[in-house]
Interface confidence: medium
């Protein structure tokens, strides 16, 4: 990969009620069909129009699903993960990882080897430093007046 995509990562608990046509989304991933290099996690690949997930509005395509009803999705075969969702019952609790892209570059996936994306302090420290420099420069300028 020539470059990378950086992410701010947040986690959320999403409780869905199974609708007439189910939960209303598709997944990719699993130990037998890694969707992201070096990451066998389960990702939301499609959200069906007017399905339970779409109507709830919080689950997004590209989200990583960490657990279903408290059951970890790590190291599962794709079909085993699918079966877990299908047998999850009427009320389904999903632990989800959202990734907000914060910097564009040549596209590359970030896998479990570096799961946290870009740490928040990596963004805040430069911003804070710039603010301090600007404040110092402003004070110096005022003293010269």
């Amino acid at each position: 990969m020539n470059g990378r995509v950086d992410y701010l990562v947040t986690e959320e608990e999403i409780n869905l009620t199974r609708g007439p046509s189910g939960l209303g989304f598709n997944i990719v991933g699993g130990t037998d069909q890694q969707y992201v290099s070096n990451d066998s996690g389960i990702y939301v690949s499609r959200i069906k129009e007017n399905g339970a997930a779409a109507l709830d509005g919080r689950l997004q395509e590209g989200d990583k699903i960490l657990s279903v009803n408290g059951q970890d999705l790590k190291n599962l075969l794709h079909q085993d993960a699918v079966d877990l969702f299908r047998n999850a019952g009427y009320a389904v609790s999903l632990r989800v990882q959202h990734r907000l892209q914060v910097q564009n570059g040549p596209i590359g996936h970030r896998g479990e080897g570096d799961p946290s994306g870009i740490p928040i302090f990596m963004v805040l420290v430069p911003v804070f430093a710039l603010t301090m420099v600007a404040a110092w420069a402003f004070m110096r300028y005022r003293q010269q007046l």
Epitope: G22, N26, R46, F85
Partner: nanobody, 127 residues
Amino acid sequence: DVQLVESGGGLVQAGGSLRLSCAASRTLFSINAMAWYRQTPGKQRELVARVTSGGSTNYADSVKGRFTISRDNAKNTVYLQMNSLKPEDTAVYYCAARGGGTSVDSDYDVEEFEYDYWGQGTQVTVS
């Protein structure tokens, strides 16, 4: 996007066999259903057979017991083995794919309008 390239069509005598192949440009892991449709001049395109990522298969009544659909994820290819061919099987055969992984709900029936990607078609003529 996924490009689909069909091959294997041709002219065959009644009672003969052909094997159609459809190669996808992207991994089949990201495709949740693939199908073969056929169309004859002046008629609507009709479903011949389909296979889901879960391995479920469905066939048109007219081809049951004669045609077999299968997929090879390693080669990103779906096949249609056609045996005991009849003159009425003459048509242009199209490969179709539905993107987006596997439904967490079921291997639901996939209608023609739900397919995202289509091949250019391959002619099968049974004399």
